[in-house]
């Protein structure tokens, strides 16, 4: 903290300009009026202030706005945003998407910091839901943003927002998150025709149930192996050899390379060896001929 001293004669700042970079910390504290700083925040971004000087400017704003900065100041924080703590940001009420964009721009190219995460959380909570424009903005800056949300948070994403999601935005999502997103995507893309629908829904299929995979197998979609490997194991297991063959189309040959990995490995264990042999891929590990398969889960359900 900079100790309070009187501003030297002739050094009182009349505007926020480059001359201030030559002030010592105590001179900035003494000679820059916080209200002037607040009205000319947009200028700070263009001036090569040091870390220490930015600390002083932040301190002045903190004193002026102990309950949190108004949005008119927040929008122009620029590099000063990087000095804010999550505690500071929790005091803010950010409602404008332009403000959000301005602050995300400052952090561009860096990992999502606790400050940014707090800012996004405040913004989304203020809006009540993750609308399409917000999602567009967030995934543009942070492609992995969607997968950083909990399934509970994802449940507030309206289906209309799913149109903004790109395949790379889902790269780090786990099955629990895809379970929530898939039904929304299915709803969002329901009016599209077969091939277009598959292109859009493909990234979300890690959350698809068996019946939807069966339906897709009837549509000549030619799912690639990378997508197949991301499907839920429990959704793949009930599929027949014929259904998997139709689902993968020419990509079915890729099963051989993946036979030791889930879900292919577990699926092979559930198929009759006779059926697997029809693929001509040399897949081994199926149920030998003459063995009876008891579906214990079905038996439990009946009792």
């Amino acid at each position: 903290e900079v100790e309070k001293t009187a501003c030297p004669s002739g050094k009182k700042a009349r505007e926020i300009d480059e001359s201030l970079i030559f002030y010592k910390k105590w001179e900035l504290e003494a000679c820059v009026d916080a209200a002037l700083l607040a009205t000319q925040m947009d200028r700070v971004n263009a001036i090569p202030f040091t870390y220490e000087q930015l600390d002083v400017l932040k301190h002045k704003l903190d004193e002026l706005y102990p309950q949190g900065y108004p949005e008119s100041v927040i929008q122009h924080l620029g590099y000063l945003f990087l000095k804010m703590s999550p505690e500071d940001i929790r005091k803010w009420n950010v409602t404008s998407l332009e403000t959000l964009k301005a602050l995300l721009e400052v952090n561009k190219g860096h990992e999502m910091s606790p400050q940014v995460a707090t800012l996004i959380d405040r913004f989304v909570k203020g809006r009540g839901q993750l609308d399409k424009d917000t999602l567009d903005t967030l995934t543009a800056f942070y492609p992995g943003y969607l997968c950083s949300l909990s399934p509970e948070e994802l449940s507030s994403v309206p289906p209309s927002s799913i149109w903004a999601v790109r395949p790379q935005d889902l790269d780090t999502c786990d099955p629990r998150q895809l379970d929530v997103l898939y039904p929304k995507a299915r709803l969002a893309f329901q009016n599209m025709n077969g091939s277009e629908y598959f292109v859009k829904i493909q990234s979300f299929l890690g959350g698809a149930p068996t019946e939807d995979l069966k339906a897709l197998s009837q549509q000549n979609v030619s799912m690639d192996l990378a997508t197949f490997m991301k499907l839920r194991t429990d959704a793949v297991l009930p599929l027949t050899v014929a259904e998997v063959q139709k689902l993968l189309g020419p990509h079915v040959e890729g099963l051989k390379a993946e036979e030791r990995h889930r879900p292919v490995r577990d699926w092979i264990l559930r198929q009759r060896q006779d059926d697997l042999d029809t693929l001509g891929l040399g897949l081994q590990g199926g149920i030998p001929n003459g063995y009876l398969v008891l579906d214990l889960s079905m038996q439990e359900a009946l009792s």
Epitope: G10, K11, S19, I21, F22, K24, N45, I47, P48, T50
Partner: antibody, heavy 119, light 106 residues
Framework: EFQLQQSGPELVKPGASVKISCKAS????????MNWVKQSNGKSLEWIGI????????SYNQKFKGRATLTVDQSSSTAYVQLNSLTSEDSAVYYC????????????WGQGTSVTVSS | QIVLTQSPAIMSASPGEKVTMTCSAS?????MHWYQQKSGTSPKRWIY???KLASGVPARFSGSGSGTSYSLTISSMEAEDAATYYC?????????FGAGTKLELK
């Protein structure tokens, strides 16, 4: 150990441009501003400008504004000054100098780069 | 811009002699900094914030002053002190340097 290593001497023709580099080591490059200073033949020193390596923000001496451009490359911890439309008046030694904490002068200087403008 | 006038431009001193050089500013400045430069080398920060000695600077050096008048003093001249000394203000935009005082060994 702190070090500012500048690029070698330059011989350039009038009207041409020159770009001088200054590679910093031994400290966190983005934590301190970098200054550039001109020293004409055995004469005094002239401040050209300053750059914040973290944000790329700059401030120039009005005399050099428009002809000098300060930039940085964070990945290599290197600062640059580019001088355009050179005349014989620009023949000098150019120094990069780190801005000291809380404006405590320029605490570390590069070894200097000699620029000679001659046809 | 603030003009800094150093005097004398050139001076010589014998070993053990007290040396004082001055720097006068055309307008008041908060602090004055001093740099030492020897022939063919880059300047070194010598005294900063008017009176603080930079790391490695012998205690025989001192700095003082305020407003428009500042000085650098060597209590007892030594051969290694022969160099040019520049004053510099960092209070006003742009920072400026004095023309230097060349100190020679008598």
């Amino acid at each position: 150990e702190f070090q500012l290593q500048q690029s070698g001497p330059e011989l350039v023709k009038p009207g041409a441009s020159v770009k001088i580099s200054c590679k910093a080591s031994g400290y966190s490059f983005t934590d301190y501003n970098m200054n550039w200073v001109k020293q004409s033949n055995g004469k005094s020193l002239e401040w050209i400008g300053i750059i914040n390596p973290n944000y790329g923000t700059t401030s120039y001496n009005q005399k050099f504004k428009g002809r000098a451009t300060l930039t940085v490359d964070q990945s290599s911890s290197t600062a640059y000054v580019q001088l355009n439309s050179l005349t014989s008046e620009d023949s000098a030694v150019y120094y990069c100098a780190r801005g000291g904490y809380d404006n405590e002068a320029m605490d570390y200087w590069g070894q200097g780069t000699s620029v000679t403008v001659s046809s | 811009q603030i003009v800094l006038t150093q005097s004398p431009a050139i001076m010589s001193a014998s070993p053990g002699e007290k040396v004082t050089m001055t720097c006068s500013a055309s307008s008041s400045v908060s602090y004055m900094h001093w740099y030492q430069q020897k022939s063919g080398t880059s300047p070194k920060r010598w005294i900063y914030d008017t009176s603080k000695l930079a790391s490695g600077v012998p205690a025989r050096f001192s700095g003082s002053g305020s407003g428009t008048s500042y000085s650098l003093t060597i209590s007892s001249m030594e051969a290694e002190d022969a160099a040019t000394y520049y004053c510099q203000q960092w209070s006003s935009n742009p920072p400026t340097f004095g023309a230097g005082t060349k100190l020679e060994l008598k």
